[in-house]
């Protein structure tokens, strides 16, 4: 995501399943923290926003030409997962330790 | 990049080296096809976006709450190389048959 | 003036072993990716795989047929390129020329046969 | 077989111009990427073209040029000097590295 002024970070998102309908099928927890990734990716990109050359270049080609193309964007580059109790098909509570992806570990310019 | 009404793609986007300096010190190409990608990441995410369960539930909370949390982002999922030939410190021409992260092979949304 | 002398060619039994070197100078070695390419007799060219300069890793790859079984390293220190061949194949046998791309050496004849 | 696709041989007399074909038939290689060594017999290759970029030493009457999934070498005011190998190579990007095609064995006549 964009930010206006501050530069590519991660922030808390606090995600109550009953908001987005998931409570229909995860029964725990009934919220948790997503974490987004907030800010702009601004020139020079830093080296903690790991940018890829792609990335650097497109920071370049956006500071000659700012109206033609546009800036890095400031996304989760990895990821954590969550542990979740959930109903299955039939119905039967189940615990998944690890449900993938759920969760943002760091955020960077790409 | 974000985009205005199209859904996440991969657009052109021709790099001249010149444009951002880097001619300095590559030799060749003079310019390559870089690509961009562009558009918006909108609710339902296609398949052909490879949305991560951070970006699905992103959306969700987007679409709940649009002015607290933004949307995914569309970005390269996948980079190519491409072949330079650069200068050394010395001057020398010298190959770098795989350079890598150069061009955007696939976008999606994150 | 650019120059790279391949040495360590000679005959070898199969299964066997060689260590093939490229002394290198003219250019700033340390951060020149380096390729090894082969030519087997009356035959084209052939990557044989590459190694990145350390400051970008010193990452190594190898073209399919000489996976698991030749390894390239360098000496930075020495300006020295090297290929250690083991496991040695009949189908080995060819000129081997180490590279940057732009510059190649005069090339060494390995030759594997019983 | 070589997933770049070259005629096993060539030829002219003096003064004539010919040209090389190299076409592509693997979707890992882009032709972008595709460049030529020379081979003269008795000697190592060397590189004679890379995208608009001819080494110095390299006579102008070589040039290169690529089309949809092919690459073309020409050579104009063709001499007895340049009768050898002229090999095509490109980026595999599978392999993470060059890919070569069979060569072509120029011969000059007469």
């Known amino acids: 995501s964009t930010g206006a002024g501050s530069h590519c970070q991660k922030t808390s998102l606090r995600v109550n399943f009953e908001d987005i309908g998931w409570n229909s099928w995860i029964i725990a927890p009934k919220e948790y923290e997503a974490y987004e990734c907030k800010g702009g990716c601004f020139f020079p990109l830093a080296d903690d926003v790991t940018p890829t050359k792609h990335a650097i270049v497109q920071t370049l080609v956006h500071l000659k030409f700012p109206t033609k193309v546009g800036k890095a964007c400031c996304v989760p580059t990895k990821l954590s997962p969550i542990s979740i109790l959930y109903k299955d098909d039939m119905g039967v509570p189940t615990l998944k330790y690890h449900y993938e992806g759920m969760s943002v570990a760091e955020c960077g310019c790409r | 990049s974000t985009g205005a009404g199209s859904h996440c793609q991969k657009t052109s986007l021709r790099v001249n080296f010149e444009d951002i300096g880097w001619n300095s010190w590559i030799i060749a190409p003079k310019e390559y096809e870089a690509y961009e990608c562009k558009g918006g990441c909108f609710f339902p995410l296609a398949d052909d976006v490879t949305p991560t369960k951070h970006a699905i539930v992103q959306t969700l909370v987007h679409l709940k709450f649009p002015t607290k949390v933004g949307k995914a982002c569309c970005v390269p999922t996948k980079l190519s190389p491409i072949s330079i030939l650069y200068k050394d410190d010395m001057g020398v021409p010298t190959l770098k048959y795989h350079y890598e992260g150069m061009s955007v092979a696939e976008c999606g949304c994150r | 003036e650019v120059q790279l002398v391949e040495s360590g060619g000679g005959l070898v039994k199969p299964g066997g072993s060689l260590r093939l070197s490229c002394a290198a100078s003219g250019f700033t070695f340390s951060n020149a990716w380096m390729s090894w390419v082969r030519q087997a007799p009356g035959k084209g060219l052939e990557w044989v795989g590459r190694i990145k300069s350390k400051t970008e890793g010193g990452d190594t790859d190898y073209a399919a047929p000489v996976k698991g079984r030749f390894t390239i390293s360098r000496d930075d220190s020495k300006n020295t390129l090297y290929l250690q061949m083991n496991s040695l194949k009949t189908e080995d046998t060819a000129v081997y020329y180490c590279?940057?791309?732009?510059?190649w050496g005069q090339g060494t004849l390995v030759t594997v046969s019983s | 077989q070589s997933v770049l696709t070259q005629p096993p041989s060539a030829s002219g007399t003096p003064g004539q111009r010919v040209t090389i074909s190299c076409s592509v038939t693997?979707?890992?290689?882009?032709?972008?990427?595709v460049h030529w060594y020379q081979q003269l017999p008795g000697t190592a290759p060397k590189l004679l073209f890379f995208h608009d970029y001819r080494p110095s030493g390299v006579s102008d009457r070589f040039s290169g040029s690529k089309s949809g999934t092919s690459a073309s070498l020409a050579i104009v005011g063709l001499q007895s000097e340049d009768e050898g190998y002229y090999y095509c190579?490109?980026?595999?990007?599978?392999?993470?590295?060059?890919?070569f095609g069979g060569g072509t064995k120029l011969t000059v006549l007469g």
């Open positions: 590279t940057t791309g732009t510059y």
């Open positions: 190579a490109g980026l595999d990007e599978a392999m993470r590295g060059p890919v």
């Open positions: 693997n979707t890992d290689i882009d032709i972008f990427n």
